[in-house]
């Protein structure tokens, strides 16, 4: 029986060109985490295997860094990075737990634009 719960960073936003940390945390279970998959909508971003360590998908290796912990750091964000991200915890003996994060990548902040065109 699955007793654990996944906590995530939920709905988050970040600026274009910046970076963001995606974090999930599995609690309330003594199940052993054997692997964590990070998926972006419909493609695999990275895998953290308890025995083999991290594997970053080749198409993302320039922009994705492992960690902190079982989380994932996305760098050089573009508006195309907007969307759903899933952390999938493979555990024994519980099975899989899934968490969802929605990332919105924004153009430079209004505050920055405002400062740039401020009337002296």
């Amino acid at each position: 029986m699955m007793t654990g719960t996944i906590e995530t960073t939920g709905n988050i936003s970040a600026e274009k060109g910046g970076s963001i940390i995606l974090q999930c945390h599995l609690s309330s279970t003594t199940a052993q985490v054997t692997q964590v998959n990070w998926e972006q909508q419909d493609q695999l971003l990275a895998i953290c295997n308890a025995d083999l360590g991290w594997h970053i998908s080749p198409s993302f290796k320039d922009r994705v860094a492992p960690g902190p912990g079982l989380g994932l750091t996305l760098q050089s964000l573009t508006v195309n990075d907007t969307g759903e991200y899933f952390c999938i915890y493979h555990t024994y003996p519980d099975g899989t737990y899934t968490g969802r994060i929605f990332l919105e990548v924004l153009e430079s902040s209004v505050a920055e634009h405002g400062a740039r065109f401020q009337i002296p």
Epitope: Q41, E84, F102
Partner: nanobody, 116 residues
Framework: EVQLVESGGGLVQPGGSLRLSCAAS????????MGWFRQAPGKEREWVAS????????YYADSVKGRFTISADNSKNTAYLQMNSLKPEDTAVYYC?????????WGQGTLVTVSS
């Protein structure tokens, strides 16, 4: 203009089943992901399931995994949520949305009540 129309809700006994439909228009269905969300009385809206056409990947919240199945028919621009083994805690208004959009276009939702 994006339009999403949910249907199929109703009153069902615990352990029963329902199939929700979401008819979508105003965007290219096959290039998108679609998601189902729900909002129970006095609670925040929560994600239930998502499907992506390009890969066929499906994702489920742990609370519905093994009981709910998300699917889609591209030719009809319609997404579905098959809900089995319903529990009282599944009672909520169910909404569909284009999962890729930062600002979701919500439909009116469809009410699912699970009660004996």
């Amino acid at each position: 203009e994006v339009q999403l129309v949910e249907s199929g809700g109703g009153l069902v006994q615990p352990g029963g089943s329902l199939r929700l439909s979401c008819a979508a228009s105003g965007f290219t269905f096959s290039n998108s992901g679609m998601g189902w969300f729900r909002q129970a009385p006095g609670k925040e809206r929560e994600w239930v399931a998502s499907i992506y056409w390009s890969s066929g990947n499906t994702y489920y919240a742990d609370s519905v995994k093994g009981r709910f199945t998300i699917s889609a028919d591209n030719s009809k621009n319609t997404a579905y949520l098959q809900m089995n083994s319903l529990k009282p805690e599944d009672t909520a208004v169910y909404y569909c949305a284009n999962s890729n959009k930062p600002k979701f276009d919500w439909g009116q939702g469809t009410l699912v009540t699970v009660s004996s």
